[in-house]
């Protein structure tokens, strides 16, 4: 869990490149002091700031760990020794997280809080994006185009990575029903040094605020604070959150007493997670034990399957997974308004999917 060894390794590798090879202990300073040339000035200060940022990101899981505390204390000592300020540029991170800042091109440095621009500058192409959605009972469309109907109750993570945490809380749609619906969504935009303060967004049925938990509508006072924003086109029923610093757009909707979640996210961001963060419905879909087959319907109310199909067909002419989800929801809830959730999910997918050939998924059962 504590990733201090990774921070140590990244620091060593960045100082090795400054030295042009050779070996170095994780916290050996090297080079002259002050603001002079060589390793002892700008380059080392950038590496130390990156090291400090890395320790900060892993701090909570490392609290009480001797190696962690030694590293942080050592960084402080080296920054004092080399007269480094804590604010300023950091060394380019290794190619694990979401895109690297542009380097050595002679062009102006890309905005560190504009993910797409930064990625395009570095790779000469736009980034790849992934789409995930949760709606209705809930039905989950994963990044990898799995489509499951889940019986999950309580709080389940849709996403849990280095940049984002999204948790959906579900409860039974009706007494005795197998199916559940999402009543609450919690989204955490994790602290990102240059760009945003940590921000929490929480929505519940009949309470879709157009603000973060602290009352703000952006990422805070940092230089890139505007790279996280929240808005609505339909107060009380729709909220859109743009997180440009991680190439992400999230839409939350309320229909028929349940919440829907839809996300378009940069691939590198979506995949920046460790082995311990393996339970994510957007990554793996519903765990097999939590999946409902369509044969597990327990119909309520007076709506027949033919009526449900007719209602759903109006807005969903293709008999794909969205159509079948719609029929399922209308039958189980007895509420024709559930057609809207599936229709909106399909529209979000149309807007968010990079490959429209994957828009219509067809269930196997």
């Amino acid at each position: 869990q504590c990733k201090i060894l990774r921070c140590n390794a990244e620091y060593v590798s960045s100082t090795l490149s400054l030295r042009g090879g050779g070996s170095s202990g994780a916290l050996r300073g090297g080079g002259g002091g002050g603001r002079g040339g060589g390793v002892g000035s700008g380059g080392l200060c950038r590496a130390l700031r990156s090291y400090a940022l890395c320790t900060r990101r892993t701090a909570r899981t490392c609290r009480g760990d001797l190696a962690f505390h030694s590293a942080v204390h050592g960084i402080e000592d080296l920054m004092i020794q080399h007269n480094c300020s804590r604010q300023g540029p950091t060394a380019p991170p290794p190619p694990r997280g979401p895109a690297l800042p542009g380097a050595g091109s002679g062009l102006p440095a890309p905005d560190p809080c504009d993910y797409e621009g930064r990625f395009s500058r570095l790779h000469g192409r736009p980034p790849g994006f992934l789409h995930c959605a949760s709606f209705g009972d809930p039905h989950v469309r994963s990044f990898h185009h799995h489509f499951h109907t889940c019986r999950v109750q309580g709080a389940w993570p849709l996403l849990d990575n280095d940049f984002l945490f999204v948790q959906a809380t579900s409860s039974p749609m009706a007494l005795g029903a197998n199916a559940t619906a999402t009543r609450k969504l919690t989204i955490i935009f994790k602290n990102m040094q240059e760009c945003i303060d940590q921000k929490v967004y929480q929505a519940e049925v009949d309470n879709l605020p157009v603000a973060f938990e602290d009352g703000s509508i952006n990422g805070g006072d940092r230089p890139g604070g505007s790279s996280l924003s929240i808005q609505t086109a339909n107060p009380g029923n729709h909220v859109e959150i743009q997180a440009a610093y991680i190439g992400t757009t999230i839409i939350i909707r309320q229909t028929a007493g349940q919440l829907s979640f839809s996300i378009k996210v940069a691939e590198d961001v979506a995949m920046a997670f460790s082995a311990e963060q393996d339970l994510q419905l957007c990554v793996g879909g519903c765990p097999p034990s939590q999946r409902l087959s369509r044969s597990e319907r327990n119909r309520r109310g007076a709506i027949t399957i033919d009526t449900a199909r007719r209602l759903c067909k109006e807005g969903l002419p293709v008999e794909d997974a969205y159509f079948h989800s719609c029929v399922f929801d209308v039958l189980i809830s007895g509420d024709p308004n559930f057609t809207v959730a599936a229709q909106a999910a399909l529209e979000d997918a149309r807007a968010f999917l990079p490959d429209l050939e994957k828009l219509h998924l067809f269930p196997s059962d």
Epitope: E76, F165, E213
Partner: antibody
Framework: EVQLVQSGAEVKKPGASVKVSCKAS????????IAWVRQAPGQGLEWMGW????????GFVQKFKGRVTATSNTDITTAYMELSSLTSEDTAVYYC????FGSGYDLDHWGQGTLVTVSS | SYELTQPPSVSVAPGQTARITCGGN??????VHWYQQKPGQAPVLVVY???DRPSGIPERFSGSNSGNTATLTISRVEAGDEADYYC???????????FGTGTKVTVL
């Protein structure tokens, strides 16, 4: 809205124990540590230590080790701090606070405080 | 162990600027946070990471930190700013949060 609500005032005899509760709401309880800080009458703030509700890990200042126990119940998003072998020097207001360790090294929301009076 | 020293008191007239210092060895290498505590109330975070303000805190509160001194500046002081102010850092080697001795700000 983030809120920390603490249990009410306590009067204890020397040698006894006190258990202070801190009910958290408005955020994901397991995503932040809880810190405990105390303030003797007319004195400054004294940091006691922290606990991670997710892992159960704790860290307390040496002077409290051996007589402090920090626990939590994640189902009811409540943290507890129990201090034993009380003396008159433990008379203070005890605060819990949300500890942004990592995303910041600060305490961004505080409980209202619990006055513990130790008197024979 | 790491120590933070603050002046016991600072007096300032309404509308003027109050500056509260927090001294510590190479404090400039650490993140400094400031809390306001009014009588009978819990502390409130007013500045974090040297100079950032939590939402809801007026722009009149600002901070700086370099060398051996961090400073909390309250401009255009109001009667409602009368309180005790504490600086705080994290002592990385000890894993302790350390509070300053506290400064009582009196608005004349």
């Amino acid at each position: 809205e983030v809120q920390l609500v603490q249990s009410g005032a306590e009067v204890k005899k020397p040698g006894a124990s006190v258990k202070v509760s801190c009910k958290a709401s408005g955020y994901i309880f397991t995503n932040y540590d809880i810190a405990w800080v105390r303030q003797a009458p007319g004195q400054g703030l004294e940091w006691m230590g922290w606990m991670n509700p997710d892992s159960g890990n704790t860290g307390f200042v040496q002077k409290f080790k051996g007589r402090v126990t920090a626990t939590s119940n994640t189902d009811i998003t409540t943290a507890y701090m129990e201090l034993s072998s009380l003396t008159s020097e433990d008379t203070a207001v005890y605060y819990c606070a949300r500890d942004r360790f990592g995303s910041g090294y600060d305490l961004d929301h505080w409980g209202q405080g619990t006055l513990v009076t130790v008197s024979s | 162990s790491y120590e933070l020293t603050q002046p016991p008191s600072v007096s300032v007239a309404p509308g003027q600027t109050a500056r509260i210092t927090c001294g510590g060895n190479n404090i400039g290498s650490k993140s400094v946070h400031w809390y306001q505590q009014k009588p009978g109330q819990a502390p409130v975070l007013v500045v974090y990471d040297d100079s950032d303000r939590p939402s809801g805190i007026p722009e009149r509160f600002s901070g700086s930190n370099s060398g051996n001194t961090a400073t909390l500046t309250i401009s255009r002081v109001e009667a409602g700013d009368e309180a005790d102010y504490y600086c705080q850092v994290w002592g990385s080697s000890s894993d302790h949060y350390v509070f300053g001795t506290g400064t009582k700000v009196t608005v004349l």
